[in-house]
Amino acid sequence: AYRPSETLCGGELVDTLQFVCGDRGFYFSRPASRVSRRSRGIVEECCFRSCDLALLETYCATPAKSERDVSTPPTVLPDNFPRYPVGKFFQYDTWKQSTQRLRR
């Protein structure tokens, strides 16, 4: 399978997740109880497959509304957790461009 054009990966993925999830933070692998199918992890989902805003939202650490699922503990950080300072240099325009591209 070849990578489709509408993918997000690398720093652009981290930037876009930071924008979409805001101060909720995000998981690098979705808690299994939050999805009907087996979670592949965001790298598998977004780096190689078409990745949209709805999919990105499922990786946010807390639901956007108040119905937080307290039965779902945060996942343990994998050993591929990024060394970059996530969100340290907030550049709204960069994230806005990425999310606009995903909406198309």
Partner: antibody, heavy 119, light 108 residues
Framework: EVQLLESGGGLVQPGGSLRLSCAAS????????MTWVRQAPGKGLEWVSS????????VYADSVKGRFTISRDNSKNTLYLQMNSLRAEDTAVYYC????????????WGQGTMVTVSS | DIQMTQSPSSLSASVGDRVTITCRAS??????LNWYQQKPGKAPKLLIY???KLEDGVPSRFSGSGTGTDFTLTIRSLQPEDFASYFC??????????FGPGTKVEIK
């Protein structure tokens, strides 16, 4: 300690085939995108191909598309590159590297394996 | 695809010199820029990541700066072991990470 060890290089005639391997240890292999990078003699570094953590998805540089196939065996912590229809311009040192998918650098490299395509 | 350019392609310098290498991206990559050193017959070695963060074990005479599209690697006081090739790499968009063409630092 993270280690990547490439093997399988050698001398092959144009049109021939080779299979490179990269044995990984010291990290959770199945969590990473794995990548092949090559360097022709006296030239710069060129990305060749990458494979998703599960092995279900692949992507290739235009220069090798249709000729090279990347694969992995997560049970053996090993990455492969099947190289067919080799050309003189494929002559290079081939390196494997791990990619977190989160914008990290390639912090560990193997020693590389030399592929020479010549008649 | 994001294209990376580097300048100069080569330079001659003496031990103790201050050396500056520049790298430019074809679009903004924020701070997702890494620098590597490579000596003949060896694999590349990570020097700096996230544009300015020094990798563990790398001497403090190496420094990096920049954000967006323009980046700089500086060697404050060139040492004999620093004569090598240097490559920049963007990791803002991956897979398909791209490298600069390299800068060869030679002895004057």
């Amino acid at each position: 300690e993270v280690q990547l060890l490439e093997s399988g290089g050698g001398l092959v005639q144009p049109g021939g085939s080779l299979r490179l391997s990269c044995a990984a240890s010291g990290f959770t292999f199945s969590a990473y995108i794995m990548t092949w990078v090559r360097q022709a003699p006296g030239k710069g570094l060129e990305w060749v191909s990458s494979i998703s953590p599960s092995g279900g998805y692949t992507v290739y540089a235009d220069s090798v598309k249709g000729r090279f196939t990347i694969s992995r065996d997560n049970s053996k912590n090993t990455l492969y590159l099947q190289m067919n229809s080799l050309r003189a311009e494929d002559t290079a040192v081939y390196y494997c590297a791990r990619d977190s998918g989160f914008g990290d650098p390639f912090d560990y490299w193997g020693q590389g394996t030399m592929v020479t395509v010549s008649s | 695809d994001i294209q990376m350019t580097q300048s100069p392609s080569s330079l001659s310098a003496s031990v103790g010199d201050r050396v500056t290498i520049t790298c430019r991206a074809s679009q903004s990559i924020r701070n997702y820029l890494n620098w590597y050193q490579q000596k003949p017959g060896k694999a590349p070695k990570l020097l700096i990541y996230a544009a300015s963060k020094l990798e563990d074990g790398v001497p403090s005479r190496f420094s990096g700066s920049g954000t967006g599209t323009d980046f700089t690697l500086t060697i404050r006081s060139l040492q004999p072991e620093d004569f090598a090739s240097y490559f920049c790499q963007q990791s803002y968009s991956s897979p398909g990470i791209t490298f600069g063409p390299g800068t060869k630092v030679e002895i004057k």
